[in-house]
Interface confidence: low
């Protein structure tokens, strides 16, 4: 895995950033956000963009505000594109963000992590030489 591509690095960074935010779930605005789950094949990138667009916000409760805001900013960074991502952008049959069940921040982050793990697994599976550990 030493020569892993930038896409994989970025997706794994996102997982750890989600884990980081889970530490501060009590400092997030407790509003309900669209949280895709059991995403159908070929709609992963559409669901990913729903997670990125969601209005996850710091509750401005003090010490943790800075790191929460930086984490949220990083979650919204555009990841390196892949062929699969480019293909999926043209699909019009994926559910709209508003059609997904809305969940509070804790469940929202858990579902986001689950989607990221699924996307990493798919990416690894699509590479005939890929393995999960170095």
């Amino acid at each position: 895995m030493q020569g892993q591509d930038r896409h994989m690095i970025r997706m794994r960074q996102l997982i750890d950033i989600v884990d980081q935010l889970k530490n501060y779930v009590n400092d997030l605005v407790p509003e309900f956000l669209p949280a895709p789950e059991d995403v159908e094949t070929n709609c992963e990138w559409s669901a990913f963009s729903c997670f990125q667009k969601a209005q996850l916000k710091s509750a401005n409760t003090g010490n943790n505000e800075r790191i929460i805001n930086v984490s949220i900013k990083k979650l919204k960074r555009k990841p390196p594109s892949t062929n699969a991502g480019r293909r999926q952008k043209h699909r019009l049959t994926c559910p709209s963000c508003d059609s997904y069940e809305k969940k509070p921040p804790k469940e929202f982050l858990e579902r986001f992590k689950s989607l990221l793990q699924k996307m990493i697994h798919q990416h690894l599976s699509s590479r005939t030489h890929g393995s999960e550990d170095s």
Epitope: M1, Q4, R12, N23, K74, E132, D133
Partner: antibody
Framework: EVQLVESGGGLVKPGGSLRLSCAAS????????MNWVRQAPGKGLEWVSS????????HYAESVKGRFTISRDNAKNSLYLQMNSLRAEDTAVYYC?????????????WGQGTTVTVSS | AIQLTQSPSSLSASVGDRVTITCRAS??????LAWYQQKPGKAPKILIH???SLESGVPSRFSGSGSGTDFTLTISSLQPEDFATYYC?????????FGQGTKLEIK
């Protein structure tokens, strides 16, 4: 207080083995990637190994690959480094280090270090 | 492996001086770079993450800049407690690597 405390260092002969441990406290250990970083006497810092929060991804420096094994026990808030086939050049202070957000936040918590001396 | 080259290797300066340390990566590492300060016999302490984000509790006289391959750590006005060794580290890809260090000494 967020804290990392290493143990297990000592004097060992070339070819011997040691197991370093790191006890974490004051934070949710299971949410963080962890690393071992070493520093030979009078030298700079050298990254040794990393393990992600759920032990899903593990990486090693070329200099230790095949000889060292990193592991963690989230239930015990502990990180380990099993070091086999030790060489004189492995002599160093070994630091247990917490990593945030795949490095975008850097390595923010360091232990005090444990000294490993490999000598006949 | 990505190589990080710090310059200068050592530097003599006086209290109140403005000091700049550079770190050059052998390939593009985006902003995945941190800076650390280490004093003799102590563990390193993080100063800057994500190339330019100041770590909580670190004095504002420290600042980081850069992206891609060229990075800079600046101390705007040296204080007595700033004399130490400084390291950069990249997190863009494995193996993670450190620069060789810059020793900042009192002139």
């Amino acid at each position: 207080e967020v804290q990392l405390v290493e143990s297990g260092g000592g004097l060992v002969k070339p070819g011997g083995s040691l197991r370093l441990s790191c006890a974490a406290s004051g934070f949710i250990f299971s949410s963080y990637s962890m690393n071992w970083v070493r520093q030979a006497p009078g030298k700079g810092l050298e990254w040794v190994s990393s393990i992600t929060s759920g032990s899903y991804y593990i990486h090693y420096a070329e200099s230790v690959k095949g000889r060292f094994t990193i592991s963690r026990d989230n239930a015990k808030n502990s990180l380990y480094l099993q070091m086999n086939s030790l060489r004189a050049e492995d002599t160093a202070v070994y630091y247990c280090v917490r990593e945030r957000g795949w490095g975008y936040y850097g390595m923010d918590v360091w232990g005090q270090g444990t000294t490993v001396t490999v000598s006949s | 492996a990505i190589q990080l080259t710090q310059s200068p290797s050592s530097l003599s300066a006086s209290v109140g001086d403005r000091v700049t340390i550079t770190c050059r990566a052998s390939q593009d590492i985006d902003s995945a770079l941190a800076w650390y300060q280490q004093k003799p016999g102590k563990a390193p302490k993080i100063l800057i993450h994500d190339a330019s984000s100041l770590e909580s509790g670190v004095p504002s006289r420290f600042s980081g800049s850069g992206s891609g391959t060229d990075f800079t750590l600046t101390i705007s006005s040296l204080q007595p407690e700033d004399f130490a060794t400084y390291y950069c580290q990249q997190f863009n890809s494995y193996p993670y690597t450190f620069g060789q260090g810059t020793k900042l000494e009192i002139k």
